[in-house]
């Protein structure tokens, strides 16, 4: 998935200013492209450091520029290099003196395994003096002064991978800066073969692309694209996409493009020379003007893309005739994606006339991993794969790139890939309160590892030894009803964010018990006052069938201070409970269970006061309504926490003495109304209630007056006493 | 592995002939120059010839040339050196040696036969 | 023919010192020239080719220089193993030429 392309404008060095520009088309490396001087080469050569610099017309690449008196530093073999995966692809170049004595028929030869190969350089400057050849450096070959031919030839029969290298020519007198260059790339199998063992056929590369032995694949010429190199780009374009754009004047004239071996150096299509500033004359084109054009109905060639075929006909010459090919287009993806950590299945979808086919189609990961679809698909007008990554993780994030390479051309979409870690809690949920059916649980979803937004919560629970169960969960603090009692049971909360896939790991796991199912409370509770500062709590003997021991547990609290509460432990034996230390005048709220090993269930609560310190009150509210000629109501109302155990009311007829009063004593303290009976008709009376406590009597301010009315008429004649 | 094994040598009276063949393994013979180097009892290395066996080119040292002749069967993967004419001064250890690709330096060499012309 | 002259023909030294031979090439031979090791009944190894190039398994310790007509072999640290006879070559032209030898013994 690196497309990496190296210009050297120019290798035959003058006094012009040269440069070296590494390009990684279409691709986001992670690690720096670097270019230097390739001492495997050539180990004598300059030593200075190169300055590389970026290229700011291009998003990924850099460049080595040599000011016009650096010249005579430049001479030697050069490298780029981008890093995928671990591996180095290395792209390599020469430079030389243009006046050098002698200059090589090309940059680069790519030939075959077995091939019988002719590296030949010309003789331009003439010396009486004998011709020396090298192999990267290493002597290889010398030919006498007065036997230096005007073309100085290396034969290689049966060429090997072994003899690839760096081949110089230079008279014997000269130096490294006076030699030519010229490499030799041997591809590790035979023509048209590819494979480790070399016994697969290559697709049949057009317009001189160069067949990959490790890969199968085409490396197409700067100008031309697609699985077969069949697709010519625009004019001045290149890359294996033809995204890249020739900046000069006349296009990519004076640009040699270096591809990764097997393909080597060439001009771009249209263009021939050592130099790559010769236009190709009429009736060639391509890289080098190697090839040309043969068009099957006289239809014009252009030096750039060849036979330009007129409407219904296609092919390189022109021989086909059918629908018109139309380069891929990559449909409906998205610059940026959001994923989930996990399994992902992402999606290329591409159009284009023929279809592209499942292998025609990869997805390449940041790191430069290639993937092929597991799933594919195509409609009348589209091609879908689909791919699987078991497990993506955050540092698969980053620019992917879908990928659709057929013989009607080659188009990459890059797109940007967010993988986000699952959320998961770092704490275990807490166990606020449990019973023998329920627990009340705070879920602690934070802190929590790994990214938001929380979408939801789930709430995982089961008995130990049995299947998890969960509830999807809003809040912190939640309630988990219909519990089995007595029964062990784990907690994990899990935690889910946005997208597919989006629900973490479940977070650590809390272990808790439910209770027994309790004992009744006791029966036949009563709670009375004992004294100022004691009250008694008295029940029914308690009956269990369970073995075990048990007691009863009281718990008491204060109405007016609700802190002041007390848990007091009873002998399972015993009936009652003396509550002592109490304050008085105070309400005391009181329930009781009965506990085994487990707790039993509360009672009701029951309420009471201590007895009083202080007289009570006057009863309130005094009313005396519904007179008659012997009745009146008497009515009132009494200050709750006084101990009142009776009222007393006390009435007499005016002007008698104080001694012929008559008392009623109420001793329910509950009654509030009383009906006085017997009274004589049209008396006045003197009326006084009291409250009447532990202490005594309160003290009443007033006496009511009252008169009752006369008697009415007898109409039978004659009273009637009842 | 690269492998180069000698064999013919023995005891010759001077004017006889003798025929050593080396047998080559391991690389690819014709892609390669096989020479033939010999060492005097006590004394140096010189060379004798050599041969390129895709094309048949052959070199010879001075003193043996007209009597000596080296060829190259790329069937077998084996050189000879027929050596007629022999004298006392040719009694030698006969090496025979791959150049490799370029008729430089020796890069492989046989164990050495061993010939001697006595009368 | 173009001559090979090795000094010096025989040399002591112990082990770990640094020993150098010297060839010169009867004219300009550019770097064409190997330096091989021969032990006793042995056929030679080559150590050096093209003057500089120190080939494939040999130790470096084994180093060699020189262009045009002077050569060197050095041996910067002389291992008991090294102990042999020592020989320079051109293939500058045919036919390639050998030096006499340089005999390093144990002193």
């Known amino acids: 998935a690196m497309d990496l392309i190296l210009i050297n404008s120019l290798p035959l060095v003058s006094d012009a200013e040269t440069s070296l520009t590494c390009i990684a088309s279409g691709w986001h490396p992670h690690e720096p492209i670097t270019i230097g001087r390739d001492f495997e080469a050539l180990m004598n050569q300059h030593q200075d450091p190169l300055e590389v610099t970026q290229d700011v017309t291009r998003e990924w690449a850099k460049k080595v520029v040599w000011k016009r008196e650096k010249a005579s530093k430049i001479n030697g073999a050069y490298f780029c290099e981008g890093r995928v995966r671990g591996q180095a692809i290395r792209i390599r170049t020469m430079k030389m003196r243009q006046q050098a004595s002698f200059l090589p028929a090309t940059l680069t030869m790519t030939v075959d395994r077995g091939d019988n190969v002719n590296i030949s350089f010309k003789k331009v400057l003439i010396k009486e003096e004998d011709a020396v050849i090298y192999k990267n450096g290493s002597f290889i070959h010398s030919v006498p002064r007065h036997e230096v031919p005007d073309i100085l030839e290396v034969h290689l029969p049966h060429a090997q991978p072994q003899d690839a290298g760096v081949y110089s020519a230079r008279y014997i007198g000269g130096n490294l800066f006076t030699s030519a260059f010229t490499r030799l790339i041997v591809r590790r199998c035979e023509a048209q073969k590819w494979g480790p063992d070399c016994n697969r056929p290559c697709t049949t590369c057009k317009n001189n692309g160069v067949c990959h032995e490790d890969t199968g694949e085409c490396i197409c010429p700067p100008g031309f694209m697609g699985r077969t190199c069949e697709k010519a780009c625009e004019p001045h374009t290149f890359g294996r996409t033809c995204k890249e754009r020739c900046s000069g004047s006349e296009g990519c004239k004076s640009y040699v493009f270096c591809l990764p071996d097997p393909y080597g150096c060439s001009c771009a299509t249209g263009w021939r020379g050592l130099q790559c500033n010769e236009a190709c004359p009429y009736g060639h084109y391509g890289p080098d003007c190697k090839l040309r054009c043969h068009c099957t109905n006289e239809e014009m060639c252009d030096r750039f893309q060849g036979c330009l075929c007129s409407q219904g006909w296609q092919g390189l010459q022109c021989e086909k005739e059918g629908r018109p090919r139309m380069t891929p287009q990559i449909e409906d993806l998205p610059d940026h994606i959001e994923v989930n950590s996990g399994k992902f299945n992402p999606i290329c979808k591409a159009s284009g006339w023929p279809l592209p086919t499942s292998e025609e189609m990869t997805l390449v990961k940041p790191d430069g991993t290639v993937l092929q679809p597991n799933d594919f698909n195509h409609t009348d007008h589209f091609s879908v794969a689909i791919f699987t990554v078991n497990r993506i993780l955050p540092p698969d994030s980053g620019v992917w790139v879908c990928s659709v390479n057929t013989v009607a051309g080659m188009v990459e979409k890059p797109f940007n890939i967010s993988v986000k870690v699952l959320p998961e809690p770092l704490h275990a949920p807490n166990v606020i309160d449990t019973g023998h059916n329920f627990a009340i649980i705070n879920i602690s979803s934070e802190p929590y590892f790994g990214d938001g937004p929380i979408k939801s919560k789930k709430l995982f629970y089961k008995p130990v030894n049995q299947a998890w169960k969960y509830i999807q969960v809003m809040n912190e603090i939640v309630t988990l009803n219909y519990l089995e009692p007595r029964t062990d049971y784990e907690l994990c909360v899990q935690l889910v964010r946005p997208g597919e896939g989006g629900e973490g790991h479940p977070g650590p796991v809390r272990r808790f018990t439910t209770a027994s199912i309790g004992l009744p409370p006791p029966r036949g509770l009563s709670l009375l006052p004992k004294s100022q500062t004691a009250l008694n709590l008295t029940w029914q003997p308690i009956f269990t069938s369970s073995e075990d021991e048990f007691y009863v547990e009281v718990e008491r609290w204060s109405q007016q201070t609700r802190s002041d509460q007390q848990n007091i432990k009873v002998p399972g034996n015993l009936t009652s409970v003396l509550l002592n230390n109490l304050l008085p005048r105070e309400q005391y709220s009181v329930r009781a269970r009965v506990n085994t090993k487990a707790q039993g269930e509360w009672s009701e609560e029951l309420r009471a006061w201590t007895l009083s310190d202080i007289l009570p009150p006057q009863p309130e509210n005094i009313k005396i309504t519904n007179i008659t000629d012997y009745t009146a109501l008497v009515s009132w109302t009494i200050v709750d926490g006084y101990s009142i155990s009776s009222i007393i009311i006390r009435y007499k007829v005016q002007g008698k003495n104080e001694d012929q009063h008559i008392d009623v004593k109420i001793k329910n303290a509950t009654i509030t109304q009383y009906q006085l009976k017997g009274l004589e008709p049209e008396t006045t009376y003197h009326v006084d209630i009291f409250a009447e406590n532990n202490i005594g009597s309160s003290n009443p301010a007033f006496s009511q007056e009252i008169r009752t009315l006369p008697a009415p008429k007898d109409l039978g004649g004659g009273k009637m006493l009842l | 592995e690269v492998q180069l094994v000698e064999s013919g040598g023995g005891l010759v009276q001077p004017g006889g002939s003798l025929r050593l063949s080396c047998a080559a393994s391991g690389f690819t013979f014709s892609g390669s120059w096989i020479s033939w180097v010999r060492q005097a009892p006590g004394k140096g290395l010189e060379w004798v010839a050599r041969?390129?066996?895709?094309?048949?080119?052959?070199y010879y040292a001075d003193s043996v040339k007209g009597r000596f002749t080296i060829s190259a069967d790329t069937s077998k993967n084996t050189a000879y050196l027929q050596m007629n004419s022999l004298r006392a001064e040719d009694t030698a250890v006969y090496y025979c040696a791959r150049n490799n690709r370029f008729p430089t330096w020796f890069d492989y060499w046989g164990q050495g036969t061993l010939v001697t012309v006595s009368s | 023919d173009i001559q090979m002259t090795q000094s010096p023909s025989s040399l002591s030294a112990s082990v770990g010192d640094r020993v150098t031979i010297t060839c010169r090439a009867s004219?300009?031979?550019?770097?064409?020239v190997a330096w091989y090791q021969q032990k006793p009944g042995k056929a030679p190894k080559l150590l050096i080719y093209?003057?500089?190039f120190l080939y494939s398994g040999v130790p470096s310790r084994f180093s060699g220089s020189g262009s045009g007509t002077d050569f060197t072999l050095t041996i910067s640290s002389l291992q008991p193993e090294d102990f042999a006879t020592y020989y320079c070559q051109q293939s500058y032209t045919t036919p390639p030429t050998f030096g006499q030898g340089t005999k390093v013994e144990i002193k």
């Open positions: 041969i390129n066996p895709y094309d048949g080119n052959t």
């Open positions: 004219q300009d031979v550019s770097t064409a």
């Open positions: 093209s003057a500089s």
